[in-house]
Amino acid sequence: EVEKTACPSGKKAREIDESLIFYKKWELEACVDAALLATQMDRVNAIPFTYEQLDVLKHKLDELYPQGYPESVIQHLGYLFLKMSPEDIRKWNVTSLETLKALLEVNKGHEMSPQVATLIDRFVKGRGQLDKDTLDTLTAFYPGYLCSLSPEELSSVPPSSIWAVRPQDLDTCDPRQLDVLYPKARLAFQNMNGSEYFVKIQSFLGGAPTEDLKALSQQNVSMDLATFMKLRTDAVLPLTVAEVQKLLGPHVEGLKAEERHRPVRDWILRQRQDDLDTLGLGLQGGIPNGYLVLDLSMQEALS
């Protein structure tokens, strides 16, 4: 808290300019009018104030706007944004994408802070859904943003927004998140032809069900092993050897190197050894010839 002292003669600020960096904290408090500051916020960012001085300027704005800053001020906060707490930000009503971009720019190149997370949360909640332009902006600044959302939050993403998602945006997503995103992607890309569709849907396939993988196996897609290894184990298990061979195309040879890792390991255990041998890869661990496989889950469903 800065003590209230009279402004020395001749030091009253008529505008926000670089001369203010030479003011002591108490002089800033006494000589800068909060209303002047609010109308000239765009200048603050161009002036190399110390963090201590920024604290004083923030204090002046807090007194002027105890219920939260108007968007006209928020948009021009610049470095002063680095002085805001999540509690401050929760008082804001940010509706303009330009304001969001301006504030994200301040933290560009640095990891997401609680302040940025709060800002994004306020913005998205205010919009009601994560539209394409917002998603475009957020993933440009934070490629991992999408995967930081809960499945519940992801459910508010409209399929049209999926066009903004790049493969790297999904790198850290877990299966629960991909389960939500995959149907949206399928819907978004449904009018594309086979090869183009596969290029777009590939990053989302960690959420694909068995029937969709079976359908893809009929389309000569040549899925790479990295994508195959990210598929849901429960979706891969029912695939036949022939279907996996068609799905992977020339990449099928990569199964040998992955035979001890899921989902390949679990899939091998479900296949007849005879069928695995047809691949000529030396995959071992399949069901020996002459053994009968009972699908107990099917039996339970019938009883």
Epitope: E18, P48, T50, S113
Partner: nanobody, 119 residues
Framework: QVQLVESGGGLVQAGGSLRLSCAAS????????MRWYRQAPGKGLELVAT????????YLGSVKGRFTISRTNAKNTLLYLQMNSLKPEDSALYIC????????????WGQGTQVTVSS
């Protein structure tokens, strides 16, 4: 963390020149603005000059035209203060300061280098 070490101070006659240096090490990529402050015996800390992250320089009125602040953003960030036409009233401990990006933004200080101007 950023470490700052000043050098270049000393005793000089009025009208003479000195060049102060401040070497920064540690998380130098996160440095935003850099500054020279000074503190004369029994007086408060006074900002002498600032160089912003975009290279713009700002000077205290009484040193404008005599002092020049500059910085290099190479692997070893260095801050300089070229002081010409020195006056006895410039005598003080000159301290280097840098601040960094982030929440909360942090301020870092050197130990200072003494400048004494004799008349």
């Amino acid at each position: 963390q950023v470490q700052l070490v000043e050098s270049g101070g000393g005793l000089v006659q009025a009208g003479g020149s000195l060049r102060l240096s401040c070497a920064a090490s540690g998380s130098i990529s996160s440095i935003r603005h850099m500054r020279w402050y000074r503190q004369a015996p029994g007086k408060g800390l006074e900002l002498v000059a600032t160089v912003s992250n975009d290279g713009s320089a700002y000077y205290l009125g009484s040193v404008k035209g005599r002092f020049t602040i500059s910085r290099t953003n190479a692997k070893n960030t260095l801050l300089y203060l070229q002081m010409n036409s020195l006056k006895p009233e410039d005598s003080a401990l000159y301290i280097c300061n840098a601040d960094t990006w982030g929440w909360p933004g942090a301020d870092y200080w050197g130990q200072g280098t003494q400048v004494t101007v004799s008349s």
